[in-house]
């Protein structure tokens, strides 16, 4: 059965938008007006995952691209990457764990915790134009809260 997906954009709690930075990286920066068209549109897929009260397992693909955010160990550190997949097989209900994020939503603020690496979150820096990364701290300098905006399919 096909997995259910919705198209959306994400902005961090400082209202920075996410854009492509090279073929396999996202960065966060403030955009206005026409430049808003540069922001990445995600296809958020509702996938299978661990049962938990307040966590909804999702996968975050780039709309109409065969790229998914995934979490892997690089030099022994949990790392966020954009991974290329076979579009014939993705998205699917049972995504590999590295593609799964636990969406935690409180008062329309979203956090995305790695299913593969608990307590590691999709994060942005306070600084402008820096890469989106996987961070192991919440409530510190780095930003882990996002808002979501729906995009017409």
């Amino acid at each position: 059965a096909p997995v259910r997906s919705l198209n959306c954009t994400l902005r961090d709690s400082q209202q920075k938008s996410l854009v492509m930075s090279g073929p396999y990286e996202l960065k966060a920066l403030h955009l206005q007006g026409q430049d808003m068209e540069q922001q990445v549109v995600f296809s958020m897929s509702f996938v299978q995952g661990e049962e938990s009260n307040d966590k909804i397992p999702v996968a975050l693909g780039l709309k109409e691209k065969n790229l998914y955010l995934s979490c892997v160990l690089k030099d022994d550190k949990p790392t966020l990457q954009l991974e290329s997949v076979d579009p014939k097989n993705y998205p699917k209900k049972k995504m590999e764990k590295r593609f799964v994020f636990n969406k935690i939503e409180i008062n329309n603020k979203l956090e995305f915790e790695s299913a593969q690496f608990p307590n590691w979150y999709i994060s942005t820096s306070q600084a402008e134009n820096m890469p989106v990364f996987l961070g192991g701290t919440k409530g510190g300098q780095d930003i882990t809260d996002f808002t979501m905006q729906f995009v017409s399919s």
């Epitope: 059965a1 909804i56 969406k103 729906f150």
Partner: antibody
Framework: QVQLVQSGAEVKKPGSSVKVSCKAS????????IEWVRQAPGQGLEWMGE????????NYNEKFKGRVTITADKSTSTAYMELSSLRSEDTAVYYC?????????????WGQGTLVTVSS | DIQMTQSPSSLSASVGDRVTITCKFS??????LSWFQQKPGKAPKSLIY???RLVDGVPSRFSGSGSGTDFTLTISSLQPEDFATYYC?????????FGGGTKVEIK
């Protein structure tokens, strides 16, 4: 508080159309699917389709495809379900319900229902 | 389409009885299963979502369990206001489908 208020009962002739409305209040209309479900007299519940007003995404039950049209007006927080080519077996109570965009909480609030009677 | 069977279609029970209603599906439906209560002439009322989560305000005598293809609604001690028809629904896959209902009547 959350409310889904539906339009009043309708009597329709076979072959005609009916449009039922569902006005939402007490929550962010954009972020919840509006579901349409019907119940024929003395029968069970049957899902017809859904719309997510924030994105415009719509999903229909194939059984009704071509006969049902679901729309939403964000400015008035109102969803609509139009069923065409009515026949006597479409006589039913039509309900709207809401479901969060991520499907987490299921059909958590329901409208009061709209009785549609199809009779010549 | 996912095929489903809700059983029993009706049952007679007394106040204080433990009541169990089951829904069986033709394939795994992950976590997207809810239970409703409906009284004559009224809209359905949500009791349980995501298999086992109790809706706010619903008494703790109601509980849900199960996984894969088999799911259960249990009323631990039936109260007078619980006499009604109960439905399960799967919203894992289109078209969403409701069970045929279980009418709980007074013995």
């Amino acid at each position: 508080q959350v409310q889904l208020v539906q339009s009043g009962a309708e009597v329709k002739k076979p072959g005609s159309s009916v449009k039922v409305s569902c006005k939402a209040s007490g929550y962010t209309f954009d972020r919840y699917w509006i579901e349409w479900v019907r119940q024929a007299p003395g029968q069970g519940l049957e899902w017809m389709g859904e719309i997510l007003p924030g994105s415009g995404d719509i999903n229909y039950n194939e059984k009704f495809k071509g006969r049902v049209t679901i729309t939403a007006d964000k400015s008035t927080s109102t969803a609509y379900m139009e069923l065409s080519s009515l026949r006597s077996e479409d006589t039913a109570v039509y309900y709207c319900a809401r479901m969060y965009y991520d499907y987490d909480q299921g059909f958590d609030y329901w409208g009061q229902g709209t009785l549609v009677t199809v009779s010549s | 389409d996912i095929q489903m069977t809700q059983s029993p279609s009706s049952l007679s029970a007394s106040v204080g009885d433990r009541v169990t209603i089951t829904c069986k599906f033709s394939q795994d439906i992950d976590r997207f299963l809810s239970w409703f209560q409906q009284k004559p002439g009224k809209a359905p009322k949500s009791l349980i979502y995501r298999v086992k989560r109790l809706v706010d305000g619903v008494p703790s005598r109601f509980s849900g369990s199960g996984s894969g293809t088999d799911f259960t609604l249990t009323i631990s001690s039936l109260q007078p206001e619980d006499f009604a028809t109960y439905y399960c629904v799967q919203y894992d896959e289109f078209p969403y489908t409701f069970g045929g209902g279980t009418k709980v009547e007074i013995k």
